[in-house]
Amino acid sequence: QPSVSPGEPSPPSIHPGKSDLIVRVGDEIRLLCTDPGFVKWTFEILDETNENKQNEWITEKAEATNTGKYTCTNKHGLSNSIYVFVRDPAKLFLVDRSLYGKEDNDTLVRCPLTDPEVTNYSLKGCQGKPLPKDLRFIPDPKAGIMIKSVKRAYHRLCLHCSVDQEGKSVLSEKFILKVRPAFKAVPVVSVSKASYLLREGEEFTVTCTIKDVSSSVYSTWKRENSQTKLQEKYNSWHHGDFNYERQATLTISSARVNDSGVFMCYANNTFGSANVTTTLEVVDKGFINIFPMINTTVFVNDGENVDLIVEYEAFPKPEHQQWIYMNRTFTDKWEDYPKSENESNIRYVSELHLTRLKGTEGGTYTFLVSNSDVNAAIAFNVYVNTKPEILTYDRLVNGMLQCVAAGFPEPTIDWYFCPGTEQRCSASVLPVDVQTLNSSGPPFGKLVVQSSIDSSAFKHNGTVECKAYNDVGKTSAYFNFAFKGNNKEQIHPHTLFTP
């Protein structure tokens, strides 16, 4: 009982004057509170509270549920308590079966005893199963059994409070421990697509997925550099214990160009925060941009292959592609494919495969592509490099020797004189006249060159060589002639092709 100091308010006194009282079930509980400023008795057990304004608390026939703490309070707010155990062999425990534990914290299994003199007050697993090896607990007959430092692994653990009574083990009703997980990592956030490209008026919708151990994770969509509240829709579900998922869907029903920008999905819990962004680009209309992967002027040797390759950006996606040459459309020899299989891909590749090109196949090759908004085209000028071909080699009536050669690039014609029977024609002869003629073939075809020399300059028997050459190769033609007295015999031309 409290000691009284004169002049100071003192706590009330209780009879019987002990901290604990044990009564048998069915017996009377009689508690007297003595204090000039008596206010009330309060009874507490588990979550139950009762009050009594009489200074004497009387329970005529005590029951196990009358076990608990009886507190008398005076007008000064000072109090004194006595704990009463109502011993009932048929009801050794009072129980509140709700059992929650915050991860890493202690939690109380609320199974206070009605008889403090039983032994081995402890916890046991249900159906004879052992408790987890690392589970530690502290029993308190007036409150229950405190589990120390709850682990996530204890979630849904089934257990009983247990005592030994007269050599036998007695179990309480079962408890199921619900563990509230602590946040030990930031939320996991992901976005349905990292970038979006839309035309004005189209709907923009993007979904952020937030995963965490519980639904108390916070999440929101934010527009970078803006405080405007965005329209979000949510769905959520539990994939099992400590595995919660939320989907936050952001929608702009009719996107405008000024909606373009970066949108951030932000999530946080007590451990920290995480975010992921998506970029929206809204264009007023679709577009196609073509990028040649090779020079648009192409030189290729006769008989060789060449690939005309373009990359192009198309939004919306391309609907028609074609390659054209001389107003004819290729039905094969080309392929068109997306640059990547990514859902956001707007880049494509088109390749035209030209094989064993002939000199007559030079010209303009055009790639055309269109989508629902625009058309675009790009032209390649293809030049086929051909070795010179000597078209004519004649002695004209005016005594001129004339050589006409065709090839690409434009051939150069050189003249040489070989005296007598020598094989090597080394002495060069300057032409009297050189002309580039217009070809009757298509542009980009062979170029024709005509060169003439005056045969009267030759005074000895011999051979005249007309040599036509360019970057690809060379070809020669020969004029043989002999003198009979002062007259030249008929010239016999022949050609020798030199690769």
Partner: antibody, heavy 119, light 107 residues
Framework: EVQLLESGGGLVQPGGSLRLSCAAS????????MSWVRQAPGKGLEWVSA????????YYADSVKGRFTISRDNSKNTLYLQMNSLRAEDTAVYYC????????????WGQGTLVTVSS | DIQMTQSPSSLSASVGDRVTITCRAS??????LNWYQQKPGKAPKLLIY???TLQRGVPSRFSGSGSGTDFTLTISSLQPEDFATYYC?????????FGGGTKVEIK
């Protein structure tokens, strides 16, 4: 002691609007998700909408999506339901309910407020 | 959306009877099922959450079982105060949905 008290119900014409409030006490309001559940006369329970403890995440039944808006003011311990474009089939007693921890049901309910949509 | 189907829609029983109500989900809901009791003119009251955990203050004659799609609410010995309508409800994913209810009447 946990208490939830709804208000704002009444008679409204089709197409009209109404705002329900739910005043909460006896617990840390911002720690709990909250829901609105309705019950048409003589019918079963229908979940209407829910909101997370912070007010960040909101959820709706398909039948009210786009017409109803749930919100909360944690500084005032109050939950709201703004109901627009009301229809006759929205006539019901509207209950405010506290969401227990993840998936553990609605552990406390208000007494309900009657909304009647009729011309 | 997940549909919840309760059966029977109503039943008559006497005090002391064992009563069983079933609830089936249209897709798996793990153990995220709750049971409520509602008396005329009153708000519903949570009886069982997580399929089998008794809410604080609910008598132990009520019990719940099941997982996945099939769930059961059992009243081991019906008491006069148990005559009411019982609802199941899934909290597995939004939108949350209730069963149609089972009315338990006095025989």
């Amino acid at each position: 002691e946990v208490q939830l008290l709804e208000s704002g119900g009444g008679l409204v014409q089709p197409g009209g609007s109404l705002r329900l409030s739910c005043a909460a006490s006896g617990f840390t309001f911002s720690d709990y998700p909250m829901s609105w559940v309705r019950q048409a006369p003589g019918k079963g329970l229908e979940w209407v909408s829910a909101i997370g403890g912070s007010g960040g995440d909101t959820y709706y039944a398909d039948s009210v999506k786009g017409r109803f808006t749930i919100s909360r003011d944690n500084s005032k311990n109050t939950l709201y339901l703004q109901m627009n474009s009301l229809r006759a089939e929205d006539t019901a007693v509207y209950y405010c309910a506290r969401g227990a921890y993840d998936g553990e049901g609605f552990d406390y309910w208000g007494q309900g407020t009657l909304v009647t949509v009729s011309s | 959306d997940i549909q919840m189907t309760q059966s029977p829609s109503s039943l008559s029983a006497s005090v002391g009877d064992r009563v069983t109500i079933t609830c089936r989900a249209s897709q798996t809901i793990s153990g995220y099922l709750n049971w409520y009791q509602q008396k005329p003119g009153k708000a519903p009251k949570l009886l069982i959450y997580d399929a089998s955990t008794l809410q604080r203050g609910v008598p132990s004659r009520f019990s719940g079982s099941g997982s996945g799609t099939d769930f059961t609410l059992t009243i081991s010995s019906l008491q006069p105060e148990d005559f009411a309508t019982y609802y199941c409800q899934q909290n597995y994913r939004t939108p949350f949905t209730f069963g149609g209810g089972t009315k338990v009447e006095i025989k």
